[in-house]
């Protein structure tokens, strides 16, 4: 027999079927030119000393073989004795170590068997009624195909599925979608209506994330507020990476889970933008405001579950940075200014009503005044901080007020609103004899003492009614008692107490008259 022809003789080896799992497989035969054909196959197992024979049985029942030696590919013409217009059955017999191993058979019409290409280029993946839909453009001149898919997860081997017949310029496949694990898919095609024809190669992997992106398990810590009024948010624990199937472990697009940080600044609600979304890798600096932080996981199918944390406001207060002057026209606040053209947000809230919404005002961008101060004023009619109670005031600043992560805290302090001078006057002043020349003066705490850092000191004034001599005694804001000494018996005195703030002198309490009785000796 000539090597270019299919030999119609008994094969030159004895029949000793090994029945082993190794051997030739994946035989595919197709036309490669108008008169040329090719068959190729794979051989699994040790290749030393293996001889391959491509077998062919014609529709007449006559059978022949091509001896290919160690080669696993053979090209032949339509003159090789194999009928290309009629159905034939082909298989490979591999002879080694006195054993024969056979491939599965393929039955086809060689002339019609064109080598089909797998889906090429961009395979679009979408979700449709809880299933996965893949769509791609049909390779040129190959309309009319049968399509199969295979898929695996990180813990399972390949499973085969059918996409059904395709007969259009675009082809598609509905595949199972896993809820919680990533999958790798591959697709292959063959000519429609030629059951024995060869399958194309498998397509490149299509990596598909789980339907539900994983719950982000992360932890945050927030640093102390720095001198610039900002504090860094840091990630203490990275989100766990999704386990991927073998073919998706390189830079496989499509399977990635992206984590985003959604910041919601709860303080200063009157600013332009309260929420900002940024990549998790880009950990922001925050002002001292209260924030809600959510980590949102999403994949090609959209967002998944999120996890939310509350970052409380930094309550560290600056007792002296804010100056408030109350005039006939209204009230003005002064504080050390930031850079040119800075927008400030002034927020205040009665102490003890932290649950309620704070009042908030946004200034126009302003430059420092000649004294290097920034200001905010309001009229008495506005009623702002008009009630005689303690207010918590926070001032935030930003040169870019629309950028949420560029706000910083200027100061956080307390202020007693309304007529603080009168409202802060100490009540229930009482005088008790202490010794022959001293008395103890007590009073109820001023309302100002409920306002942290506002009450600078108490002043106790004692006036000798005979000589009109006056002495004043400063008392720590935490104390509500003082002892007055060196008093003379029989002399009438009046005592008054006032409560002072850093910027305001308090009003004196009602005068209390007392005298020390003259001791009469027996």
């Amino acid at each position: 027999c000539r090597t270019s022809e299919c030999c119609f003789q008994d094969p030159p080896y004895s029949d000793a079927d090994s029945g082993s799992a190794s051997g030739p497989r994946d035989l595919s035969c197709y036309r490669i030119s108008s008169a040329g054909y090719e068959c190729s196959w794979q051989y699994e197992g040790p290749t030393a000393g293996v001889s391959h024979f491509l077998r062919c049985c014609l529709s007449s029942g006559r059978c022949c073989y091509f001896a290919t030696g160690s080669a696993t590919r053979l090209q032949f013409s339509d003159q090789a004795g194999v009928s290309v217009l009629h159905t034939v059955t082909l298989w490979v017999e591999s002879w080694a170590r006195n054993r024969t191993e056979k491939s599965p058979e393929v039955t086809l019409q060689l002339y019609k068997s064109v080598k089909y290409k797998p889906p090429l280029g961009d395979i679009k993946v979408s979700k449709l009624a809880g299933q996965l839909r893949m769509e791609w453009e049909t390779p040129d001149n190959q309309v009319g195909a049968e399509v199969q898919f295979r898929h695996r997860t990180p813990s399972s081997s390949w499973k085969l599925g059918d996409c059904g017949p395709q007969d259009d310029d675009t082809e598609s496949c509905l595949c199972p979608l896993e809820m919680n694990v990533a999958q790798e898919f591959q697709l292959r095609r063959r000519r429609l209506g030629s059951q024995g024809s060869s399958w194309s190669k498998w397509s490149s992997p299509v990596c598909v994330p789980p339907e539900n992106p994983p719950q982000p398990q992360v932890r945050f810590s927030v640093e102390q507020l720095g001198r610039d009024g900002r504090r860094r948010l840091t990630l203490k624990e990275q989100p766990t990476q999704l386990e991927l199937p073998e073919g998706c472990q390189g830079p496989a697009p499509g399977v990635e889970v992206t984590y985003q940080l959604q910041l919601h600044m709860l303080s200063c609600p009157c600013k332009a933008k309260a929420t900002r979304t940024l990549p998790l890798e880009k950990m922001p600096y925050l002002s001292g405001a209260a924030y809600n932080v959510a980590v949102i996981s999403s994949n090609r199918f959209g967002p998944g579950p999120n996890q939310t944390w509350h970052i409380p406001a930094d309550t560290h207060t600056e007792p002296v940075a804010l100056n408030i002057s109350v005039g006939t026209n209204g009230t003005t606040m002064y504080w050390p200014a930031r850079a040119q053209s800075t927008t400030y947000c002034i927020e205040w809230q009665p102490v003890g009503q932290e649950g309620s919404l704070a009042t908030c005002n946004l200034t126009a961008p302003q430059d420092p005044d000649p004294a290097g101060m920034a200001t905010y004023s309001w009229s008495r009619e506005s009623g702002a901080m008009g009630q005689e109670k303690c207010y918590h005031i926070t001032i935030f600043a930003s040169a870019h007020p629309k950028k949420l992560t560029l706000w910083s805290t200027v100061l956080s302090t307390y202020h007693f609103g309304g007529n603080a001078s009168a409202a802060g006057t100490p009540h229930h002043v009482s005088v008790k004899n202490h010794s022959l020349d001293s008395v103890s003066v007590d009073w109820a705490p001023s309302l100002l003492s409920t306002c942290p850092g506002v009450l600078k000191e108490y002043v106790v004034r004692c006036r000798d009614e005979d000589s009109n001599q006056v002495s004043e005694h400063p008392v720590q804001p935490t104390e509500t008692q003082v002892t007055l000494s060196d008093l003379r018996a029989g002399v009438a005195y009046t005592v008054q107490v006032r409560a002072d703030t850093a910027w305001l002198r308090g009003a004196w309490s009602q005068p209390q008259r007392f005298s020390i009785k003259v001791q009469v000796s027996d």
């Epitope: 003789q9 529709s59 029942g61 006559r62 059978c63 159905t87 039955t107 024995g196």
Partner: nanobody, 125 residues
Framework: QVQLVESGGGLVQAGGSLRLSCAAS????????MGWFRQAPGQEREFVAA????????YYADSVKGRFTISRDNAKNTVYLQMNTLKPDDTAVYYC??????????????????WGQGTQVTVSS
């Protein structure tokens, strides 16, 4: 080797039908080309039909074409011969055969290395 047991033979009137079955045990059934042969009294054993391993391609002797159909069920390790429009000339012992390696022709009995005991088919006129 594979062991083969035929069943389904019997007496049938001309024009009737029979279905022969051949159950295989032993080696992997799907690795064999399966065939049916028959032998009438005083005659040589002759080829009737064969089916390739994948069950797609089938072959028939001219005398039975269009009347007989060979099929196989690899899951059940069984090959069948459906015989319709039977004639008295079809009277013979029908043998099931298995070829692990096909020679120069599917109909060549020397390719078949495993044989059943045979089942008698008698067609009366």
């Amino acid at each position: 080797q594979v062991q083969l047991v035929e069943s389904g033979g019997g007496l049938v009137q001309a024009g009737g039908s029979l279905r022969l079955s051949c159950a295989a045990s032993g080696r992997t059934f799907s690795s064999y080309v399966m065939g049916w042969f028959r032998q009438a009294p005083g005659q040589e054993r002759e080829f009737v039909a064969a089916i390739m391993r994948n069950g797609i391609m089938t072959y028939y002797a001219d005398s039975v074409k269009g009347r007989f159909t060979i099929s196989r069920d690899n899951a059940k390790n069984t090959v069948y011969l459906q015989m319709n429009t039977l004639k008295p000339d079809d009277t013979a012992v029908y043998y099931c055969a298995a070829a692990s390696r096909v020679g120069v022709s599917i109909s060549q009995s020397s390719s078949y290395t495993s044989w059943g005991q045979g089942t008698q088919v008698t067609v009366s006129s």
